[in-house]
Interface confidence: low
């Protein structure tokens, strides 16, 4: 639907389901007035998830969407939701008329054109419908991971997509495990990537009017075994009041199967360390990474005896990592008192 003076949907009633998804082409500079719901009880208008204010150049007011003069940045997805509910009364996309023949990625509208839409529109060269989802150009992934490249596009007639690897047609026939092409999702999926999958992957989207392409770079990292990596700052020094519950958190990354222990440092015969140089510890919790919530240590109804140093210890076949934090327990009757706990220790 190309407007000459003003775009308007009348009457202001909830549309039938057939009307619920629409695409409207609006010429630059033209005013827009769209309605949904009944005048006094009209729905709220949203653009790209943000509710429109009742005043301003683009406004949602008494069930009406009003744009004084249509600009390129006004293109996008608009929703009208019924008052007091999340029922969608209108779901439409406004497209800039002046960019109909453009294939410049930067000027393409952000929204996805539904090919099943019943409204007629002129021929249009392919364009990216979600360029923001294509911003990650370099994909560096560990060997064995799954990689998915997407080039969501639209146009009229509906364009086709094909893929190139390092400039050559790519169908994955020489790749162990093959590839999955999901044309309706404009995607290429490769499972269990290996170093030979490294390269430049190009999506080529074309129709009778024009074509566009985009390059993704894939680097496959050979995973080197290493000792577990613990997220810095965890577990964190914590202060709690007697009787309260405490959670200490430890985030572990390990390529090799890790085992995790939560330890509390204790004193035996007035000493914190044994003859072997190791601290005396009490094992509070031990498991592997697959165990439920092993990365969290729960301390219920803490007392003064629970105060002290706690260590999250993670080990695998390569080595060992551990980080410690201090729990300070304050007396219930004096919550203003604080003690300076020693810094958390980060040890090799």
């Amino acid at each position: 639907l190309e407007a000459s003076e003003e775009v308007e949907l009348e009457p202001c009633l909830a549309p039938s389901l057939e009307q619920q998804e629409q695409e409207l082409t609006v010429a630059l500079g033209q005013p827009v007035r769209l309605c949904c719901g009944r005048a006094e009880r009209g729905g709220h208008w949203y653009k790209e998830g943000s509710r429109l204010a009742p005043a301003g150049r683009v406004r949602g007011w008494r069930g009406r969407l009003e744009i004084a003069s249509f600009l390129p940045e006004d293109a996008g997805r608009y929703l009208c939701l019924a008052r007091g509910s999340m029922i969608v009364l209108q779901n439409l996309t406004l497209i800039t008329g002046d960019s109909l023949t453009s294939s410049n990625d930067d000027e393409d509208p952000k929204s996805h054109r539904d090919p099943s839409n019943r409204h007629s529109y002129p021929q249009q060269a392919p364009y990216w419908t979600h360029p923001q989802r294509m911003e990650k150009k370099l994909h560096a992934v560990p060997a064995g991971n799954t990689v998915k490249f997407r080039c969501p596009a639209a146009g009229n007639p509906t364009p086709t997509i094909r893929w190139l690897k390092d400039g050559q047609a790519f169908h994955g026939e020489n790749r162990i495990g093959g590839i999955r092409l999901r044309h309706q999702h404009w995607s290429l999926v490769m499972e269990s990537v290996v170093p030979s999958d490294r390269g430049t992957y190009t999506c080529l989207v074309e129709n009778a009017v024009g074509s566009i392409r985009y390059n993704y770079l894939l680097d496959v990292l050979e995973r080197s075994p290493h000792r577990p990596i613990l997220q810095a700052g965890l577990p964190a020094n914590t202060t709690a009041v007697v009787g309260s519950d405490v959670e200490l958190l430890c985030k572990v990354y390990s390529d090799a199967q890790p085992h995790i222990q939560w330890l509390k440092h204790i004193v035996i015969n007035g000493s914190s360390f044994g003859a072997d140089g190791f601290p005396y510890v009490q094992v509070l919790k031990t498991a592997d990474i697959n165990s439920s919530e092993v990365e969290v240590l729960y301390l219920r109804n803490v007392s003064a005896e629970d105060a002290g140093e706690y260590t999250c210890l993670a080990g695998n076949s390569i080595g060992l990592s551990y980080q410690s934090a201090w729990l300070t327990v304050l007396p219930e009757e004096d919550p203003t008192w604080t003690a300076a706990a020693p810094e958390a220790r980060y040890t090799d």
């Epitope: 064995g144 995973r223 080197s224 075994p225 290493h226 000792r227 390529d255 090799a256 199967q257 085992h259 222990q261 330890l263 140089g277 190791f278 510890v281 592997d288 210890l313 993670a314 080990g315 695998n316 076949s317 390569i318 080595g319 060992l320 090799d348």
Partner: antibody, heavy 121, light 110 residues
Framework: EVQLLESGGGLVQPGGSLRLSCAAS????????MNWVRQAPGKGLEWVAV????????YYADSVKGRFTISRDNSKNTLYLQMNSLRAEDTAVYYC??????????????WGQGTLVTVSS | QSVLTQPPSASGTPGQRVTISCSGS????????VNWYQQLPGTAPKLLIY???QRPSGVPDRFSGSKSGTSASLAISGLRSEDEADYYC???????????FGGGTKLTVL
């Protein structure tokens, strides 16, 4: 008690092949990286290869890359070393080794008794 | 040539203190902890020191280890005749993605 028992060593001609096995017991084999380490007569220790707990990662010393293949069968608790294109300099005692940690109190570092591979014409 | 450098030999008289050095680089000793092995003639290596300076149970306190930067050392005090053996340092090398060893030091008790 942890036990690693190597087998499959023997005399082989240059260019020939041999497959070593290592039967493991006394620990969770499937949770540990496994290694082969060799020692030529009168020489020092040389690491040969390592395989991850699930077999997905394998790394080799440059001296054996492309000729030796490390593998494992977790259902049989067995580690293997397939040795092809053998050379005189591959003559050595081959040890099956698992290295890990008894996390906190002590080491987890066990060696088999070794099996002798002799490459000679 | 070994990735880690050790002196080929060392010697001492009973009761003496002997130190064996092990030099590496940032990708091995500089990044990871060091193990020391003792190999008596005709036997498999036995772990002597792990995590730079820790002794497994059963290893006498005459054996001690230390690490500084990209070097490590093994000290044996109160030397005994049964300490006569080959000693190897070892660590993981991040660049080579494997375990590396020193060339070994033959300790002779005079």
């Amino acid at each position: 008690e942890v036990q690693l028992l190597e087998s499959g060593g023997g005399l082989v001609q240059p260019g020939g092949s041999l497959r070593l096995s290592c039967a493991a017991s006394g620990f969770t084999f499937s949770s540990n990286y496994m290694n082969w380490v060799r020692q030529a007569p009168g020489k020092g220790l040389e690491w040969v290869a390592v395989i991850s707990y699930d077999g997905s990662n394998k790394y080799y010393a440059d001296s054996v890359k492309g000729r030796f293949t490390i593998s494992r069968d977790n259902s049989k608790n067995t580690l293997y070393l397939q040795m092809n294109s053998l050379r005189a300099e591959d003559t050595a005692v081959y040890y099956c080794v698992t290295k890990s940690r008894d996390f906190w109190r002590g080491p987890f570092d066990y060696w088999g008794q070794g099996t002798l591979v002799t490459v000679s014409s | 040539q070994s990735v880690l450098t050790q002196p080929p030999s060392a010697s001492g008289t009973p009761g003496q203190r002997v130190t064996i050095s092990c030099s590496g680089s940032s990708s091995n000793i500089g990044s990871n902890t060091v193990n020391w092995y003792q190999q008596l003639p005709g036997t498999a290596p036995k772990l002597l020191i792990y995590r730079n300076n820790q002794r497994p149970s059963g290893v006498p306190d005459r054996f001690s280890g230390s690490k500084s930067g990209t070097s490590a050392s093994l000290a044996i005090s109160g030397l005994r005749s049964e300490d006569e053996a080959d000693y190897y340092c070892s660590t993981w090398d991040d660049s080579l993605r494997g375990w590396v060893f020193g060339g070994g030091t033959k300790l002779t008790v005079l």
